[in-house]
């Protein structure tokens, strides 16, 4: 299991239109539900729950989202719609270049996206917890233009490659 | 951050049409779903429709089909809402709302637009 | 369709209470579920979604529970700006339908 690089990039607009950036690091995992690849998109934060197939609305079809799903605690939903294997599907097949689970609430995931599948993702399928998931959610909870650039060896330094 | 800017109050004679405009800003227009909710006063909210940005594609509820026509101007990240024949029980505060990723919740709204139908 | 009954319609309670309203809908809805505050002249404001999740910014006195066809909405300790008109909202299945709104006065 490698270690992903995550660098997150928090776009604040200021009044004049400008942008200032704020860039983050964290570290998570590549799991073997997935390619061990980089990625790069703007986040797009999703409940475990929006990823089911509930309602009739059609899907956005855009592609090239870094999709941030934080588990639950599985006794919040002892039946869930998919496993999270089949959630990390459902995001790719709805236009994710990669897929970020926290998994803080929910360590036993790990195990379920580490246990092989003959028909791996050719997208990244990352987990992030503790420190990392922490920094990453704050982050997204910022309800703010976030991007997400994954990468499977340290970053360069200084980060330039950025560009909206 | 993000904010969705309503068009102002409107007063329309019974049978006429109104548009209302809803202009998005502060994050990716076309990847979010716009909903349209009504509240007439004094009234609960009831829900009218959705448009998705990105294809154009919509919906809406039975009752306001073929009374009801949403677009969107993706040049100005701007959706619309038009209600045609109205009558006077098409009196209420028009909302426009952004939707979460999964349909879990309008996480945004805007200020609201108040279309007064009389004679 | 499916129809939202709230309850009680109006409620009144003091500074410091804890208060409980409940929404029932009318066939399973799984945890398709929001919560939303509207104070007087201004628009809704998303409190709590797919049952139990509080959106960001949103105090912790705040927290729902439920799934299928039971749902609950707990302000744990009342507050002054907390008198409102809370509503549930399902959105399983279009016509995404609202409960009736319950008015929270100050007693």
């Known amino acids: 299991k490698e270690t992903a690089f995550v660098e997150v990039v928090l776009f604040e607009s200021s009044p004049s239109g400008d942008y200032t950036t704020y860039t983050t690091g964290l570290t998570g995992r590549f799991s073997r539900a997935g390619a061990t690849l980089s990625a790069e998109g703007e986040i797009v934060q999703m409940h475990p729950l929006g990823l089911c197939n509930n309602n009739d609305e059609e899907d956005l079809y855009e592609y090239g989202w870094v999709g941030v799903v934080k588990l639950e605690q599985p006794e919040l939903d002892p039946k869930p719609c998919l496993t999270v294997l089949g959630k990390a599907k459902r995001a790719v097949q709805r236009g994710a270049t990669a897929v970020i689970f926290d998994v803080s609430e929910n360590p036993e995931a790990i195990d379920q996206l580490n246990q092989g599948s003959e028909d791996p993702l050719k997208r990244p399928v990352v987990y992030v917890k503790g420190a990392d998931a922490i920094k990453l959610m704050n982050i997204v909870n910022k309800q703010k233009v976030a991007r997400a650039r994954i990468q499977h060896r340290p970053p360069r330094q200084p980060t330039e490659y950025f560009d909206m | 951050q993000v904010q969705l800017v309503q068009s102002g109050a409107e007063v329309k004679k019974p049978g006429a049409s109104v548009k209302v405009s809803c202009k998005a800003s502060g994050y990716t227009f076309t990847s979010y779903y716009m909903h349209w909710v009504r509240q007439a006063p004094g009234q609960g909210l009831e829900w009218m429709g959705w448009i998705n940005p990105n294809t154009g594609g919509t919906k809406s509820a039975q009752k306001f089909q073929g009374r009801v026509t949403m677009t969107r101007d993706t040049s100005t990240s701007t959706v619309y809402m038009e209600l045609s024949s109205l009558r006077s029980e098409d009196t209420a505060v028009y909302y426009c709302?952004?939707?979460?990723?999964?349909?879990?919740?309008?996480?945004?709204w805007g200020q609201g637009t108040l279309v007064t139908v009389s004679s | 369709d499916i129809q939202m009954t709230q309850s009680p319609s109006s409620l009144s309670a003091s500074v410091g209470d804890r208060v409980t309203i409940t929404c029932r809908a009318s066939q399973d809805i799984s945890r398709y579920l929001a919560w939303y505050q509207q104070k007087p002249g201004k628009a809704p404001k998303l409190l709590i979604y797919a049952a139990s999740t509080v959106e960001s910014g949103v105090p912790s006195r705040f927290s729902g529970s439920g799934s299928g066809t039971d749902f609950t909405l707990t302000i744990s300790s009342l507050q002054p700006e907390d008198f409102a008109t809370y509503y549930c909202?399902?959105?399983?299945?279009?016509?995404?339908?609202f409960g009736q709104g319950t008015k929270l006065e100050i007693k």
């Open positions: 909202q399902q959105s399983y299945r279009s016509p995404y339908t």
């Open positions: 709302a952004r939707v979460l990723r999964g349909s879990l919740g309008f996480d945004y």
